[in-house]
Amino acid sequence: DGCKDIFMKNEILSASQPFAFNCTFPPITSGEVSVTWYKNSSKIPVSKIIQSRIHQDETWILFLPMEWGDSGVYQCVIKGRDSCHRIHVNLTVFEKHWCDTSIGGLPNLSDEYKQILHLGKDDSLTCHLHFPKSCVLGPIKWYKDCNEIKGERFTVLETRLLVSNVSAEDRGNYACQAILTHSGKQYEVLNGITVSITERAGYGGSVPKIIYPKNHSIEVQLGTTLIVDCNVTDTKDNTNLRCWRVNNTLVDDYYDESKRIREGVETHVSFREHNLYTVNITFLEVKMEDYGLPFMCHAGVSTAYIILQLPAPDFRAY
């Protein structure tokens, strides 16, 4: 169908509550484009009827609420005047009871659900809520170990819990809760946040931290286009270089002739205490020779790799 396939990282989600995912892939979505969502390679688009539990809302796919059976790979197709991209998003739904201590922690939690407070400082936690404009969010309530947070040291301001004079006792399991209203119906959103305490005043030492990838394999079909971001946090004054290598050679040099695999242009976002750098690697067309090779992201002395692997055959199709 002429669409380029792009594989995004997994999203791990909680059942029985609303969830939304926005299909944006700059610079593709910055112009005049149409966006259509599909589930599990279905030819039938996701409904745009707002009464449907799962429906497309502008560029978003919206689950009201998410259910156990919604796990799977969703595709959004972005069609421009001269281009077509298909973005694959793997959604995994789990049953999580935030106040049930017998249930272990969650695997691969994103940074939004793992936050740090700095000992002895005034700091804050953020409740990350990503929903389209059609969803009206109410004020946020905060809980620690399932009890609503009260006290002079804690103040709620918009999506943040301000914590003054952070102490070691502030580590633990937090949750932020908001009521979401959509088409007159109300839903509860509850995000769990694991909070750790650090004594470091600044963002950290001079060793860069690779947030993604995490030394793992990525299932990808032969012949598809794949873009993988390397996300690195580092101090503002760092002089570290960030790059992608294969067989201990810069990918741009290794694939100098074919230019089939290229390193992207580095971008960064400046935060108060650190920078977040992103440099991607693009596989224009995945070939058999790419499987099993560690593609290494380097950031100063830090490294992390991805290994491409063929998807396991789906015997249900036979």
């Epitope: 804050s124 953020t126 990350h128 002079e152 301001l157 918009e158 301000l162 963002y203 935060f271």
Partner: antibody
Framework: EVQLQQSGPELVKPGASVKMSCKAS????????MNWVKRSPGKSLEWIGR????????RYDQKFKGKATLTVDKSLSTAYMQLNRLTYEDSAVYYC??????????WGQGSTLTVSS | DIVMTQAAFSNPVSLGTSASISCRSS???????????LSWYLQRPGQSPQLLIY???NLVSGVPDRFSGSGSGTDFTLRISRVEAEDVGVYYC?????????FGAGTKLELK
């Protein structure tokens, strides 16, 4: 429909006190903080402070501590602001404004205070 | 306290043309969570202020998409793509990063 209905204009003498009200309707009063904002003639907006109607705890801008006292009556879904030891500089329009998922999402119509001898 | 700076007046604009209003903060409003805690309000003549944009670029439901917000950590712009008569008034920026919450002095949008 969310509404914040403020009390009417006040004309008071220097040194006196005044208590203005802000009656909330159309939402659960105790779920949202209530802010108070001052707009003096020819000046910008100034945040005075805010109160958590559920617990009654208030936070003030340093320069309004001792000048403003914020209280609520949960049974009446009403927030109050008392201003003490009034001077001519206190002449202004005072707004109540709700905050929740974002700050100042709904505003009252304003209460005009005139301090004059 | 964080000081918010705005010009008192914008350049007079014609109906149907675009307008830009600027605001500057004395400290970066970009939090380590990646969110920029800046809001824009419009106070029309004889009315109370009205929230237009929150967290720098998020349009409040019901506000026309002629309005958009952008900026860096300390320099912010409110853009109105096609100015209408009802857009006349004073535009205030405000920071919600930390207490005390502070406003800019307001910029008056005037028509040619």
């Amino acid at each position: 429909e969310v509404q914040l209905q403020q009390s009417g204009p006040e004309l008071v003498k220097p040194g006196a006190s005044v208590k203005m009200s802000c009656k909330a309707s159309g939402y659960t009063f105790t779920d949202y903080h209530m802010n108070w904002v001052k707009r003096s003639p020819g000046k910008s907006l100034e945040w005075i402070g805010r109160i958590n109607p559920d617990y009654g705890d208030a936070r003030y801008d340093q320069k309004f501590k001792g000048k403003a006292t914020l209280t609520v009556d949960k049974s009446l879904s009403t927030a109050y602001m008392q201003l003490n030891r009034l001077t001519y500089e206190d002449s202004a329009v005072y707004y109540c404004a709700r905050d929740g998922y974002y700050v100042f999402d709904y505003w009252g119509q304003g209460s005009t205070l005139t301090v004059s001898s | 306290d964080i000081v918010m700076t705005q010009a008192a007046f914008s350049n007079p604009v014609s109906l149907g043309t675009s307008a830009s209003i600027s605001c500057r903060s004395s400290k970066s409003l970009l939090h380590s969570d990646g969110i920029t805690y800046l809001s824009w309000y419009l106070q029309r003549p004889g009315q109370s202020p009205q929230l237009l944009i929150y967290r720098m670029s998020n349009l409040v439901s019901g506000v026309p998409d002629r309005f958009s917000g952008s900026g860096s950590g300390t320099d912010f712009t409110l853009r109105i793509s096609r100015v209408e008569a009802e857009d006349v008034g004073v535009y205030y920026c405000a920071q919600t990063l930390e207490f005390p919450l502070t406003f800019g002095a307001g910029t008056k949008l005037e028509l040619k």
